[in-house]
Amino acid sequence: LTCLGGFASPGPVPPSTALRELIEELVNITQNQKAPLCNGSMVWSINLTAGMYCAALESLINVSGCSAIEKTQRMLSGFCPHKVSAGQFSSLHVRDTKIEVAQFVKDLLLHLKKLFREGQFN
């Protein structure tokens, strides 16, 4: 998350390229849904706090055979400092709550947009 560190500087602050690309990919996914995303697969909900990139990847990596989120999985791995494999869980998962992948992606997108919005005002 160090790429967010520069947002407090004065003047125009372009979003980090990686974060911009992740947000744009999540936008593509949410707006291009013609059928239930990943056949309506359910994933563990996560706490959208520090470490959320790894937690998000740990949730989504358990969805297999869904080409729509493969690019997102690759992008998230670039934000997560450690290797993530299927079946791995962190304390950031809300283990008693499963939601559809489509809702998970939209929640993550909203949080990332808000992160950037709030960062640019500080």
Epitope: V13, I23, V27, N28, Q31, A102, K106, K113, Q120
Partner: antibody, heavy 122, light 107 residues
Framework: QVQLVESGGGLVQPGGSLRLSCAAS????????INWVRQAPGKGLEWVSG????????LYADSVKGRFTISRDNSKNTLYLQMNSLRAEDTAVYYC???????????????WGQGTLVTVSS | SYELTQPPSVSVAPGQTARISCSGD??????VSWYQQKPGQAPVLVIY???DRPSGIPERFSGSNSGNTATLTISGTQAEDEADYYC??????????FGGGTKLTVL
């Protein structure tokens, strides 16, 4: 507090030109998408054009493409709309409206100016 | 191009709950904003990101969005809530899109 003040409206003949301005204050102008939205008398809202925080991207509704040009001067905290080849159907109140943030997906307006009336008539 | 459809008018008794719908293809995959506009005035944002309220907007305003329909709910509607309401969203192709507007009448 956020303030957007439009000017430059008036009566113009069909085929004529007009340049609208929007003076912004109360926020970091160079960190937001800004839009022009219009409202014909007794009608609904119609998005006209938008410009990225750093002028790197300009977007137009099909109805004005090729006739209107949006621009901004971040050193003056001012937004512009150059309107050429005006038609009767361009008659409307033109609002300057700030976007939610700097991302393309954050173009949706939050704060609006009071508007300036453009009347195209012979 | 992307289109949003709203009912032209909705009526509600004071103190009752008003619901204004906004329908569009997979609107649940976008983030919806709602604007209130009173005669002769500029629009005012009352809901953004589906269900967030800007500061200064009363708690009686709330929003929801899923599937093909977004809804603005006004609980305990007051006379001052009488206005035109517009839904809006951002779409990758059309950019900013607004619904046709709904006139809310408080009986």
């Amino acid at each position: 507090q956020v303030q957007l003040v439009e000017s430059g409206g008036g009566l113009v003949q069909p085929g004529g030109s007009l340049r609208l301005s929007c003076a912004a204050s109360g926020f970091t102008f160079n960190s937001y998408w800004i839009n022009w939205v219009r409202q014909a008398p007794g009608k609904g809202l119609e998005w006209v054009s938008g410009i990225a925080y750093d002028s790197s991207n300009t977007l137009y509704a099909d109805s004005v493409k090729g006739r209107f040009t949006i621009s901004r001067d971040n050193s003056k905290n001012t937004l512009y709309l150059q309107m050429n080849s005006l038609r009767a159907e361009d008659t409307a109140v033109y609002y300057c409206a700030r976007g939610l943030g700097a991302f393309h997906a954050d173009m949706q307006p939050d704060y609006w100016g009071q508007g300036t009336l453009v009347t195209v008539s012979s | 191009s992307y289109e949003l459809t709203q009912p032209p008018s909705v009526s509600v008794a004071p103190g009752q709950t008003a619901r204004i719908s906004c329908s569009g293809d997979n609107i649940g995959g976008t983030f919806v904003s709602w604007y209130q506009q009173k005669p002769g005035q500029a629009p005012v944002l009352v809901i953004y990101d589906d269900n967030d309220r800007p500061s200064g907007i009363p708690e009686r305003f709330s929003g929801s969005n899923s599937g093909n329909t977004a809804t603005l709910t006004i609980s305990g509607t007051q006379a001052e809530d009488e206005a035109d309401y517009y839904c809006g969203t951002w779409d990758m192709v059309t950019n900013n899109v607004f619904g046709g507007g709904t006139k809310l009448t408080v009986l």
